[in-house]
């Protein structure tokens, strides 16, 4: 019996069939962040809830120390949403006063770390200028895409300013990945 | 013949192989909303087109009365975009007049209802303050993530203000889910 | 041996089993755009990197001349993010001066072209008014959803103003699709 028995004629003979319920998957949810040391010139990484509420890891996808560990090579869909909230930037007043005005911004980066490679790889970035005219503001940045990952790769979510992250609800700020 | 015949050595023997084309899937598109009564203190749920144009449901994933019905337990990727549009709020003027200013906001929630559980579960929330200075404004909120659902669970999309939803085009406001 | 041997009892007998690693997939990343002619009343299409850095196409999913070519009928998840950046719109000043004020906007459309069908189909649209009060602004629009596509369909990403697209980093602006 060959591996391509029930597959379309273009399927590679050597491609293994695979039960979907057995694939590495994780959905992590926000927790209150504690101030930690991080590398200069690198955005701080968020840490996550991995088993309570809506959060889970399964099928050898593990979470440890801010990282999702990729247990098996393949193509993964990776996603995250970070909800930010803050006080109004004074950029509109600064502008009216005629001084140069660099807008504040909020940024989310999903980063891949490969031990054999010296530099982290930025997989996804969402970045937005913030120059609100109301009092308090809040808004999400959502990211999601497919990447080819190797067993042993590690994924993390970095943000421009950890103090602006809304950690109050598990449905507002989250991070996930699943093998396709 | 064992279930893991063509699978990597780490596959569980009992995990069933499954044809992808047979999995429950739905993509729903916006329709014009009509003013209705709904539970007080709960955001109103949108209703959807499920068979015309780009919309479809398949493989026992059914749509009824604002809900997507989950026909089979498993991990689902769930997504929605809602495009909002409205007229400029007077929030900037209020601020200039020195009065306290709580900004208006737009919010989308993807909610799970389980009959055996008294309270709905908020799976995903996108929320954004709105304090625009132009005349009319418009913007989307996108959400998507993976969740473990049970057969019989129901999914809906709730919004903070149904009057602001742009119902004019099927590509602007939509809701979908598929079994992984 | 029947096709449903290891599948749940509700599986269609005729549904072929399929190795996941064999499915058509692509993740394309931004490149600097060159000014080109495009049809009047149609937003210009972006062109993309398909093999360097994070970009790839595999399993007969090909990229050519701004289009992703769909090699096989089925349900695909399609996504894109476009990061825009620009100078401040003058809409706030226009409003204060009491002149008519149409807000500027940024729009992303994922479009399907079917050779046998005269008109392109807009699958997904993200559109946002831009009326910023700071100096320079930047922000992403993210889209993603599932669609039933036919072999031979072509996908492209159109934007309202190609000159506002941030082409500087592969993680900021991207386009992808994969067979479910």
């Amino acid at each position: 019996l060959k591996g391509q028995e029930f597959a379309p004629s273009h399927q590679q003979v050597y491609a293994p069939l695979r039960a979907d319920g057995d694939k590495p998957r994780a959905h992590l949810t926000v927790v209150r962040q504690t101030p930690t040391q991080h590398f200069k010139n690198q955005f701080p990484a968020l840490h996550w809830e991995h088993e309570l509420g809506l959060a889970f890891t399964k099928n050898r996808m593990n979470y440890t120390n801010k990282f999702l560990l990729i247990p098996e090579s393949g193509d993964y869909f990776i996603y995250s949403q970070v909800t930010f909230r803050g006080m109004t930037s004074e950029c509109s007043e600064i502008r009216q006063a005629g001084r140069p005005n660099k807008p504040d911004s909020i940024t989310v980066v999903i980063t891949k770390v490969t031990d054999s490679y010296p530099e982290p790889t930025q997989l996804l970035m969402g970045t937005k200028s913030v120059c609100e005219v109301g009092s308090n503001w809040f808004q999400p940045i959502y990211l999601g895409a497919m990447f080819s990952l190797q067993e042993g790769d590690k994924l993390m979510v970095n943000v421009s300013d950890i103090s602006l992250v809304d950690y109050t609800k598990e449905d507002k700020t989250f991070f996930g990945a699943f093998l396709l | 013949l064992k279930g893991q015949e063509f699978a990597p050595s780490h596959q569980q023997v009992y995990a069933p192989l499954r044809a992808d084309g047979d999995k429950p899937r739905a993509h729903l598109t916006v329709v014009r909303q009509t003013p209705t009564q709904h539970f007080k203190n709960q955001f109103p749920a949108l209703h959807w087109e499920h068979e015309l144009g780009l919309a479809f449901t398949k493989n026992r994933m059914n749509y009824t009365n604002k809900f997507l019905l989950i026909p089979e337990s498993g991990d689902y990727f769930i997504y929605s975009q809602v495009t909002f549009r409205g007229m400029t709020s007077e929030c900037s003027e209020i601020r200039q007049a020195g009065r306290p200013n709580k900004p208006d906001s737009i919010t989308v929630v993807i909610t799970k209802v389980t009959d055996s559980y008294p309270e709905p579960t908020q799976l995903l929330m996108g929320t954004k303050s709105v304090c625009e200075v132009g005349s009319n404004w418009f913007q989307p909120i996108y959400l998507g993530a993976m969740f473990s659902l049970q057969e019989g669970d129901k999914l809906m999309v709730n919004v903070s203000d149904i009057s602001l939803v742009d119902y004019t085009k099927e590509d602007k406001t939509f809701f979908g889910a598929f079994l992984l | 041996l029947k096709g449903q041997e290891f599948a749940p009892s509700h599986q269609q007998v005729y549904a072929p089993l399929r190795a996941d690693g064999d499915k058509p997939r692509a993740h394309l990343t931004v490149v600097r755009q060159t000014p080109t002619q495009h049809f009047k009343n149609q937003f210009p299409a972006l062109h993309w990197e398909h093999e360097l850095g994070l970009a790839f196409t595999k399993n007969r999913m090909n990229y050519t001349n701004k289009f992703l070519l769909i090699p096989e009928s089925g349900d695909y998840f399609i996504y894109s993010q476009v990061t825009f950046r620009g100078m401040t719109s003058e809409c706030s000043e226009i409003r204060q001066a009491g002149r008519p004020n149409k807000p500027d906007s940024i729009t992303v459309v994922i479009t399907k072209v079917t050779d046998s069908y005269p008109e392109p189909t807009q699958l997904l649209m993200g559109t946002k008014s831009v009326c910023e009060v700071g100096s320079n602004w930047f922000q992403p629009i993210y889209l993603g959803a599932m669609f039933s596509l036919q072999e031979g369909d072509k996908l492209m990403v159109n934007v309202s103003d190609i000159s506002l697209v941030d082409y500087t980093k592969e993680d900021k602006t991207f386009f992808g699709a994969f067979l479910l």
Partner: antibody, heavy 117, light 106 residues
Framework: EVHLLESGGGLVQPGGSLRLSCAAS????????MSWVRQAPGKGLEWVSG????????YYADSVKGRFTISRDNSKNTLYLQMNSLRAENTAVYYC??????????WGQGTMVTVSS | DIQMIQSPSSLSASVGDSVTITCRAS??????LNWYQQKPGKAPKFLIY???SLQSGVPSRFSGSGSGTDFTLTISSLQPEDFATYYC????????FGQGTRLEIK
């Protein structure tokens, strides 16, 4: 059934004030934006003012800005329009309407406001 | 503000006729145009949204078309109850109505 009922119209002298009310029933009032639209005798329709479902955002036509104030009490399912410094040109039938993404789905029957000395 | 100009201001037609009313915007309003019908002494009734989509319960003899600056409302086979005044309304930038078109029995 969705129903809107305006009240508070009447005769008022130029420079005077009037407060219109619109009682809503049959739908979850707090989830819908509302507007006031007026129609002068023998003339066309003119949008006057709007308010978001939560009441945090208000919108006005230039012709009434600074003189009219729209508000709502979601606990009473009631919309209001406070009209000050009234002028003869404000004479009209005032309708309240449910606004859905810039269109007016459902209208009340209207209340007549006459500004005259 | 965006001006909406309807034409004609009035027209006469007979039962069974087909009539077209035009609405022109002073600048592009995409497809954000709505149509209403009003009978004497009554509140307006919502007919068409997004330039061409029929509100539920509205007879299919009513149709709308157009985008950008030029729009039309067509009534394909006039019925006695269709004689009324018709208004267009844009919601692209703030809200403005056309001046109305009065449709009378010939």
């Amino acid at each position: 059934e969705v129903h809107l009922l305006e009240s508070g119209g009447g005769l008022v002298q130029p420079g005077g004030s009037l407060r219109l009310s619109c009682a809503a029933s049959g739908f979850t009032f707090s989830s819908y934006a509302m507007s006031w639209v007026r129609q002068a005798p023998g003339k066309g329709l003119e949008w006057v003012s709007g308010i978001s479902g939560g009441g945090g955002s208000t919108y006005y036509a230039d012709s009434v800005k600074g003189r009219f104030t729209i508000s709502r009490d979601n606990s009473k399912n009631t919309l209001y329009l406070q009209m000050n410094s009234l002028r003869a040109e404000n004479t009209a039938v005032y309708y309240c309407a449910i606004e859905m993404a810039g269109a007016f789905d459902i209208w009340g029957q209207g209340t007549m406001v006459t500004v005259s000395s | 503000d965006i001006q909406m100009i309807q034409s004609p201001s009035s027209l006469s037609a007979s039962v069974g006729d087909s009539v077209t009313i035009t609405c022109r915007a002073s600048q592009s309003i995409s497809y954000y145009l709505n149509w209403y019908q009003q009978k004497p002494g009554k509140a307006p009734k919502f007919l068409i949204y997004a330039a061409s989509s029929l509100q539920s319960g509205v007879p299919s003899r009513f149709s709308g078309s157009g985008s950008g600056t030029d729009f039309t409302l067509t009534i394909s086979s006039l019925q006695p109850e269709d004689f009324a005044t018709y208004y267009c309304q844009q919601s692209y930038s703030s809200i403005t109505f056309g001046q109305g078109t009065r449709l009378e029995i010939k």
